[in-house]
């Protein structure tokens, strides 16, 4: 985790700062949303528990051609210890429900903000 944030700032950053950056990006996405995010693309809902970062990446990586979430995808890859490819579903998924990317981002943001407020950075 301490190696995160290289794309936003030089050198390693503390885990709290890395989580800050991800929250900031998700806030920006939700606040700057005018047209439907990613043209209303649907993604698998995930369990917001252990393995959440990899699960979130596995879900979002299947959305292509959506520049609004590219930075989020890169950030999540920094939180996930293994390489994630499109079509891969090895992490904890509730693979019975699909939701719009916009709702996915809102749900993820709420959960990450709670983790941040609790001081759970790892």
């Amino acid at each position: 985790l301490t190696c995160l944030g290289g794309f936003a700032s030089p050198g390693p950053v503390p885990p709290s700062t890395a989580l800050r950056e991800l929250i900031e990006e998700l806030v920006n996405i939700t606040q700057n949303q005018k047209a439907p995010l990613c043209n209303g693309s649907m993604v698998w809902s995930i369990n917001l528990t252990a393995g959440m970062y990899c699960a979130a990446l596995e879900s979002l990586i299947n959305v292509s051609g959506c520049s609004a979430i590219e930075k989020t995808q890169r950030m999540l890859s920094g939180f996930c210890p293994h390489k994630v490819s499109a079509g891969q579903f090895s992490s904890l998924h509730v693979r019975d429900t699909k939701i719009e990317v916009a709702q996915f981002v809102k749900d993820l943001l709420l959960h990450l903000k709670k983790l941040f407020r609790e001081g759970q950075f790892n």
């Epitope: 950053v13 800050r20 709670k114 407020r117 001081g119």
Partner: antibody, heavy 123, light 107 residues
Framework: EVTLRESGPGLVKPTQTLTLTCTLY??????????VDWIRQPPGKGLEWLAH???????RYNPALKSRLTISKDTSKNQVVLKLTSVDPVDTATYYC???????????????WGQGTLVTVSS | DIQMTQSPSSLSASVGDRVTISCRAS??????LNWYQQKPGKAPKLLIF???MKPRGVPSRFSGSGSGTDYTLTISSLQPEDIATYYC?????????FGGGTKVEIK
């Protein structure tokens, strides 16, 4: 209008437990994104953050005082209570409560403050 | 914990002067820097948050700037009612920490 009002004992003896109450007006701690912080200021000195509590009962403490501090809320009374155990004369200070909001980015900026309550620790 | 260092600890300036107060953090705080004004015998008041954003009602002569570890509060034209102690506070992550304060007086 948003107002916060602290109340406390004024004088506490060393080793006793200090209990401070912050009553909230004009906003509710049951509302999403609302939080309340406690800050203290010894006479003639600077500000020291003690603890905060969020609407969903998430709590954080100053590590230097964590073992002695407990923060809690009573949503029905719209109050936040701070307890500081085993007080010492160095805990003599004006104790403030303040509101913080976590909408959007979490700024941890305290936008409304109470007037403060002076607590003296002496035998 | 993130340490906050303010300078100067006190200053004396004339009415109408431009006043600057500096605040340095022990690590990059990503613009999560807040400024408070505390008048004698009163509670602190939020003056600037997130480096440069102002709550409603704060006079335009107050402004904030900075990034990374270094931040500045500027009073463009000092007024008699600005006599106070000014504190910076990092809001990156708890434990929230304050600078030692800068006492501003009128010459």
């Amino acid at each position: 209008e948003v107002t916060l009002r602290e109340s406390g004992p004024g004088l506490v003896k060393p080793t006793q437990t200090l209990t401070l109450t912050c009553t909230l007006y004009g906003f509710s701690l049951s509302t999403s994104d609302m939080g309340v912080d406690w800050i203290r200021q010894p006479p003639g000195k600077g500000l020291e953050w003690l603890a905060h509590i969020w609407w969903d009962d998430v709590k954080r403490y100053n590590p230097a005082l964590k073992s002695r501090l407990t923060i809690s809320k009573d949503t029905s009374k719209n109050q936040v209570v701070l307890k500081l155990t085993s007080v010492d004369p160095v805990d003599t200070a004006t104790y403030y409560c303040a509101r913080t909001v976590s909408s959007g980015y979490i700024y941890y900026a305290m936008d409304y403050w109470g007037q403060g309550t002076l607590v003296t620790v002496s035998s | 914990d993130i340490q906050m260092t303010q300078s100067p600890s006190s200053l004396s300036a004339s009415v109408g002067d431009r006043v600057t107060i500096s605040c340095r953090a022990s690590q990059d705080i990503r613009n999560y820097l807040n400024w408070y004004q505390q008048k004698p015998g009163k509670a602190p008041k939020l003056l600037i948050f997130y480096t440069s954003m102002k709550p409603r009602g704060v006079p335009s002569r107050f402004s904030g700037s900075g990034s990374g570890t270094d931040y500045t509060l500027t009073i463009s034209s000092l007024q008699p009612e600005d006599i106070a102690t000014y504190y910076c506070q990092q809001g990156l992550t708890p434990p929230l920490t304050f600078g030692g304060g800068t006492k501003v007086e009128i010459k």
